[in-house]
């Protein structure tokens, strides 16, 4: 129902924590430059005014739009063109074009420097001292660093984040029991970031409709005894609730999706028996539990889908009375019995059916052309499992690193003309499948693999079209959202390529590189790897793997050495000829 | 909704000839092959005739062909069947499906082929 005041509607719904979280959330999202100090007082500001609107839903300016008051604050910042640049012409806009605006200006990649974690004692001191403000940076830090990250579900993280420094600040030990659970969160919450971006774009670059599709697919996977209306309601929810989001909707999004987690856990009997543990939990723990619950037992009498969609006489009947729906089915009773499937997959093989369906029922003996549908899926189902049983046979061989790096000697041969820290980034992302994804029981692999590559493949094709540099990407990223991974997967080398020159000094490296963390050294020797690939992108496996060997001891030695400083300045010249003679 | 609305059935003698209408609404006509079926009193429905969407390609079961030939109107989303030589088993009533159906989803249009 309407509302007299949405902002005390929703500061009424949400109670006061959320809200303020909420808000310093959005404002972190719209404005990355932002200190921490300057969006807190924002959204003290904001909220003393939704606290006065909750007083007197009369009181002025109460019944102005959240868009209206959150871009009127957001346009009041000093220095706004000086930091900002051309986002400050969004306010001279009138809504909905000034949020609109602001959306296009949000930035998936800010020059911002990496978030990095403060040590043990001095996170638990400031904790200690002011835990809210110390939350309200987590969620500022998070939130600019990801301008499209699912804020509800980010909630939810930053509860973790405290409920972990709760427990170790307490502990004699407090590094050894934070570093290994935080880096746990920071990782789901990285495939969280990159998941909820490729959501975004569906609905940005597709329209709801695809994203209702993916949502069809995907809650028919995992609630496989629920009739196809309960799917559709879900779906259609679930639809409203990431359209928000995405929007920059987000106390609206959050709210919503509080409450269709009251409607799943109000309405089990029609939807899985998998859902109680997850509806005891209070609400961020609830809603968060729901989004990834195990798939429900699947009914087993389910008939053949060819019944159906290939056998009944009406299909083309059906199809003609209403497309959207026959489809929606389609991709329902499918999805259902596939679990072991990946959503790509399963909109692909939907999307054959649809023009299949599209080009038979146009014929004069339409059953006799769609007769064969199910056979010619086949081809589709086969080659994502090839990819999963490829590159996890990989995996198990070279280990993460080593997926890695193969990944991205053949992602840079691919697309050699991409930045070298964009492609090292890429790799890495998609290394981490093997870690993820490979050690899970058979059944979940496809699902696991294939939507997981889908969406670090959205964040690369993001980045490539700010400063789009290579055709092979501008194609496959051109494309529709499902055919993107095995498009990239059916990329070869770039003929087109002209390979780099060969400098010395991309080669030349420094005692400085003995004391960066693991990671960091890895990500040096990565970045080593893809410029030898430019500089040589037909160089064989072979060839790469010496020159690796080569660089590895190089460092192992000059590292061990009592004179560092010496051992590189002498031994590094000498592996730089080396390389160019293995690689010649 | 789909709604498919036929009529030009009638009463005709032996050698006499009939044109079927079939006027179609609800659908993108010219995307979908079209059949003309008819059902004998105590009989089974009986595929007749069928077109595809552009109009090219059509096909005729083996007791009509060379008597009856199909049609269809897209502008005016109509499909047609002229029936000649009509003979006391052509006696049905005549009903357009979409694609590849046999089942009947509309009233039809009663012919009867009578001296």
């Known amino acids: 129902e309407a509302h007299k005041s949405e902002i005390a509607h929703r500061y009424n719904d949400l109670g006061e924590q959320h809200f303020k979280g909420l808000v310093l959330i959005a404002f972190s999202q719209y404005l990355q430059k932002c200190s921490y100090d300057e969006h807190a007082k924002l959204v003290q500001e904001v909220t003393d005014f939704a606290k006065t609107c909750v007083a007197d839903e009369s009181a002025a300016n109460c019944d102005k739009s959240l868009h209206t008051l959150f871009g009127d604050k957001l346009c009041a910042i000093p220095n706004l063109r000086e930091n900002y640049g051309e986002l400050a012409d969004c306010c001279t806009k009138q809504e909905p074009e000034r949020n609109e605006c602001f959306l296009q200006h949000k930035d998936d990649n800010p020059s911002l420097p990496p978030f990095e974690r403060p040590e043990a004692e001095a996170m638990c001191t400031s904790f200690k001292e002011n835990p809210t403000t110390f939350m309200g940076h987590y969620l500022h830090e998070v939130a600019r660093r990801h301008p499209y990250f699912y804020a509800p579900e980010l909630l939810y993280y930053a509860e973790q984040y405290n409920e972990i420094l709760t427990q170790c600040c307490a502990e004699a030990d407090k590094e050894s029991c934070l570093t290994p659970k935080l880096d746990g969160v920071k990782e789901k919450a990285l495939v969280s970031s990159v998941r909820q971006r490729m959501k975004c774009s569906s609905m940005q670059k597709f329209g709801e409709r695809a994203f209702k599709a993916w949502a069809v697919a995907r809650l028919s996977q995992t609630f496989p005894n629920a009739d196809f209306a309960e799917i559709t309601k879900l779906a259609t929810d679930l639809t409203k609730v990431n359209k928000e989001c995405c929007h920059g909707d987000l106390l609206e999004c959050a709210d919503d999706r509080a409450e269709l987690a009251k409607y799943m856990c109000e309405n089990q009997a029609t939807i899985s028996s998998k859902l109680q543990t997850c509806c005891d939990k209070p609400l961020l723990k609830k809603a968060h539990c729901l989004s990834e619950v195990e798939h429900d037992t699947m009914p087993a009498d389910l008939p053949a889908i060819a019944a159906d969609f290939v056998e009944d006489q009406e299909v083309c009947k059906n199809y003609a009375e209403a497309k959207d729906v026959f489809l929606g089915t389609f991709l329902y009773e499918y999805s259902r019995r596939h679990p072991d499937y990946s959503v790509s997959l399963l909109l692909r093989l939907a999307k054959k059916y649809e023009a299949t369906l599209e080009k038979c029922c146009a014929e004069a003996n339409p059953p006799a052309c769609y007769g064969t549908v199910l056979a010619e899926f086949q081809p589709l189902v086969e080659e994502p499992k090839n990819l999963v049983k490829t590159n996890c046979d990989l995996y198990e061989k070279l280990g993460e690193y080593g997926f890695q790096n193969a990944i991205l000697v053949r992602y840079t041969q691919k697309a050699p003309q991409v930045s070298t820290p964009t492609l090292v980034e890429a790799a890495r992302n998609l290394g981490r499948v093997g870690t993820k994804c490979c050690t899970l029981p058979e059944d979940q692999r496809l699902p696991c693999v294939e939507d997981y590559l889908s969406a670090i493949l959205n964040r690369v094709c993001l980045l490539h079209e700010k400063t789009p540099v290579s055709e092979h990407v501008t194609k496959c990223c051109s494309g529709s959202l499902v055919e993107r991974r095995p498009c990239f997967s059916a990329l070869t080398v770039d003929e087109t390529y002209v390979p780099k020159e060969f400098k010395a000094e991309t080669f030349t490296f420094h005692s400085d590189i003995c004391t960066l963390p693991e990671k960091e050294k890895q990500i040096k020797k990565q970045t080593a790897l893809a410029e030898l690939v430019k500089h040589k992108p037909k160089a064989t496996a072979e060839q790469l793997k010496t020159v690796m060997d080569d660089f590895a001891q190089f460092l192992d030695t000059c590292c061990k050495a009592a004179d560092k400083d010496t051992c590189f300045s002498t031994e590094g010249p000498n592996l730089v000829t080396r390389c160019k003679d293995a690689l010649a | 909704q789909v709604q498919l609305v036929e009529s030009g059935g009638g009463l005709v003698q032996p050698g006499g000839s009939l044109r079927l209408s079939c006027a179609a609404s609800?659908?993108?006509?010219?995307?979908?092959?079209m059949s003309w079926v008819r059902q004998a009193p105590g009989k089974g429905p009986e595929w007749v005739s069928a077109?595809?969407?552009?109009?090219?390609?059509?096909r005729y079961a083996e007791s009509v062909k060379g008597r009856f030939t199909i049609s269809r109107d897209n502008a005016k989303k109509t499909l047609y069947l002229q029936m000649n030589s009509l003979k006391p088993e052509d006696t049905a009533v005549y009903y357009c499906?979409?694609?590849?159906?046999?089942?009947?989803g509309s009233q039809g249009t009663q012919v009867t082929v009578s001296s």
């Open positions: 499906t979409i694609g590849g159906s046999t089942s009947r």
């Open positions: 609800g659908f993108t006509f010219g995307s979908f092959g």
């Open positions: 077109i595809d969407g552009g109009g090219a390609d059509t």
